[in-house]
């Protein structure tokens, strides 16, 4: 037989089909010019010593073969003995190691078989009524196709599906969408209405995420508040990566899961913007405020479930940083200014009450005064911190108040509101004899002592009613008792106690009279 002709004889090897899974597959045959034809196939398995034979049977009952050697592509003309106008069946037999391996048959009319391309270029993927919709432009001059898809998950083999006939400039396919696993899709096409025409190659992989993005399993930690009033939020555990099918590993556009961080600053509710969304990779610095942090996972089909954490406020207080002066016109706070043109947010809430009851005020951008201080004033009529109780005050600062992640904590401290000097006056002052020349003075704790850092000291004043001499004794804010010694028997004394803050002298308690009785010896 001539090499250019199909040989109408028994093949030069015994028929010993191995039935193995490897071997020739994906045989495609088509016309490539007016009188020339091509068949190509793939071979799976070791290629050493393999000889391929393209087999052809005609409807007349005769069969022939082309010897292709080690090649997996073969061209022939319409003069090679193969009927091109009538239906023929073709397959490949690969002879190796004393056995034959067969490809599946293709049955077609060669003359009408055009080489079809798989979907080329961009395949658009969208979700439609719980299914996956793929859409692509029909390859040039190939309108009218039958389309198939195959799909697999990381744990399942390929499954074949049908897209149905296509007859337009754009083609589309509805495919199953998995809820929780990524899928790899490939598409192939063949000429519509041409009995037995060959399938195109499979398209490049189309990688599709699950309908539900994986729930982020992450943990955060927050560092200590730094000197600049900011603390870093750090990710303790990265989100688990989505398992991908084989063809989507490495570069898999389409299956990306985007994790975003949504910050909600709970403190200082009077600021302009309370939430900000960031990429998870860019961990922000936060002020000492309380925050809710949500991690939102999303893919090309939209957001999934999110996970939310609460980051409590940093309650570290600096009792001396804030000066408060109470005048007839109202109250003014002073604190060390941060920088030029800063906006401050002053937040206060009664101690022991729910954080939801916080009140705040936003200052206009201000520069430091000549002493380097920033200020905030309010009148008595405003009612701010007007009740005689302990308030927790936090001051935040930002040069860009519209940017949530640029706030910093200036200070946190406690303040006793209303008329603190009067409200803080100690009550229930009592005097007990202690010795021949001393007494013990006790009092109930000042209301100011409920406010950490506010009560600087108690002062006990003792007045000799005879000589009008006065002595004052400072007492630690944690103490409610003092011993007065060096007293004289028979002399009348009055004792008073006051509670002082760092910026305010207290009001004396009601004078308490006492005297040490003269001891008469027997």
């Amino acid at each position: 037989c001539r090499t250019s002709e199909c040989c109408f004889q028994d093949p030069p090897y015994p028929d010993a089909d191995s039935g193995s899974a490897s071997g020739p597959r994906d045989l495609r045959c088509y016309r490539i010019s007016s009188d020339r034809y091509e068949c190509s196939w793939q071979y799976e398995g070791p290629t050493a010593g393999v000889s391929h034979f393209l087999r052809c049977c005609l409807s007349s009952g005769r069969c022939c073969y082309f010897a292709a050697g080690s090649a997996t592509r073969l061209q022939f003309s319409d003069q090679a003995g193969v009927s091109v106008l009538y239906t023929v069946t073709l397959w490949v037999e690969s002879w190796a190691r004393n056995q034959t391996e067969k490809s599946p048959e293709v049955t077609l009319q060669l003359y009408n078989s055009v080489k079809y391309e798989p979907p080329l270029g961009d395949i658009k993927v969208s979700k439609l009524a719980g299914q996956l919709r793929m859409e692509w432009e029909t390859p040039d001059n190939q309108v009218g196709a039958e389309v198939q898809f195959r799909h697999r998950t990381p744990s399942s083999p390929w499954k074949l599906g049908d897209c149905g006939p296509q007859d337009d400039d754009t083609e589309s396919c509805l495919c199953p969408l998995e809820m929780n696993v990524a899928q790899e899709f490939q598409l192939r096409r063949r000429q519509l209405g041409s009995q037995g025409s060959s399938w195109s190659k499979w398209s490049s992989p189309v990688c599709v995420p699950p309908e539900n993005p994986p729930q982020p399993q992450v943990r955060f930690s927050v560092e200590q508040l730094g000197q600049d009033g900011r603390r870093r939020l750090t990710l303790k555990e990265q989100p688990t990566q989505l398992e991908l099918p084989e063809g989507c590993q490495g570069l898999a556009p389409g299956t990306e899961v985007t994790y975003r961080l949504q910050l909600h600053m709970l403190s200082c509710p009077c600021k302009a913007k309370a939430t900000r969304t960031l990429h998870l990779g860019k961990m922000p610095y936060l002020s000492g405020a309380a925050y809710n942090v949500a991690v939102i996972s999303s893919n090309q089909f939209g957001p999934g479930l999110n996970q939310t954490w609460h980051i409590p406020a940093d309650t570290h207080t600096e009792p001396v940083a804030l000066n408060i002066s109470v005048g007839t016109n109202g109250t003014t706070m002073y604190w060390p200014a941060r920088a030029q043109s800063m906006t401050y947010c002053i937040e206060w809430q009664p101690v022991g009450q729910d954080g939801g009851l916080a009140t705040c005020s936003l200052t206009a951008p201000q520069d430091p005064d000549p002493a380097g201080m920033a200020t905030y004033s309010w009148s008595r009529e405003s009612g701010a911190m007007g009740q005689e109780k302990c308030y927790y005050i936090t001051i935040f600062a930002s040069a860009h108040p519209e940017k949530l992640t640029l706030w910093s904590t200036v200070l946190s401290t406690y303040h006793f509101g209303g008329n603190a000097s009067a409200a803080g006056t100690p009550h229930h002052v009592s005097v007990k004899n202690h010795s021949l020349d001393s007494v013990s003075v006790d009092w109930a704790p000042s209301l100011l002592s409920t406010c950490p850092g506010v009560l600087k000291e108690y002062v006990v004043r003792c007045r000799d009613e005879d000589s009008k001499q006065v002595s004052e004794h400072p007492v630690q804010p944690t103490e409610t008792q003092v011993t007065l010694s060096g007293l004289r028997a028979g002399v009348a004394y009055t004792v008073q106690v006051r509670a002082d803050t760092a910026w305010l002298r207290g009001v004396w308690s009601q004078p308490q009279r006492f005297s040490i009785e003269v001891q008469v010896s027997d």
Epitope: D17, C57, R62, T89, K102, V106
Partner: nanobody, 126 residues
Framework: EVQLVESGGGLVQAGGSLRLSCAAS????????MAWFRQAPGKEREFVAG????????HYVDSVKGRFTISRDNGKNTVYLQMNSLKSEDTAVYYC???????????????????WGQGTQVTVEP
């Protein structure tokens, strides 16, 4: 040992249908083109229908075209003959036969076939 076992024959009224099956064992079924022959009393065995190893091509004798359909299931090592609109002249013993698919995939004469079954009787009453 190669065995081809036919089944599905029987008595049927004219115009009725039957489906014959031929189960193969002891051979690599997908290497063989298969055919159905029939032999009426006092006549020679005649070719009815043939099919290539993968089922891509089929061939029928003119007298059964449009009425009979040959098919195969390589997973089940079985070839079938669906016979519709049966006529009394279809009465015969039906045999299935197999041949390696070398330079031909069917022969109209029995001598081109390597293996044969024992046959199944089909009787069509007028």
């Amino acid at each position: 040992e190669v065995q081809l076992v036919e089944s599905g024959g029987g008595l049927v009224q004219a115009g009725g249908s039957l489906r014959l099956s031929c189960a193969a064992s002891g051979l690599t079924f997908r290497n063989y083109a298969m055919a159905w022959f029939r032999q009426a009393p006092g006549k020679e065995r005649e070719f009815v229908a043939g099919i290539t190893w993968g089922g891509g091509l089929t061939h029928y004798v003119d007298s059964v075209k449009g009425r009979f359909t040959i098919s195969r299931d390589n997973g089940k090592n079985t070839v079938y003959l669906q016979m519709n609109s049966l006529k009394s002249e279809d009465t015969a013993v039906y045999y299935c036969a197999g041949k390696t698919q070398g330079s031909t995939w069917y022969h109209l004469t029995p001598d081109g076939y390597d293996y044969w079954g024992q046959g199944t009787q089909v009787t069509v009453e007028p």
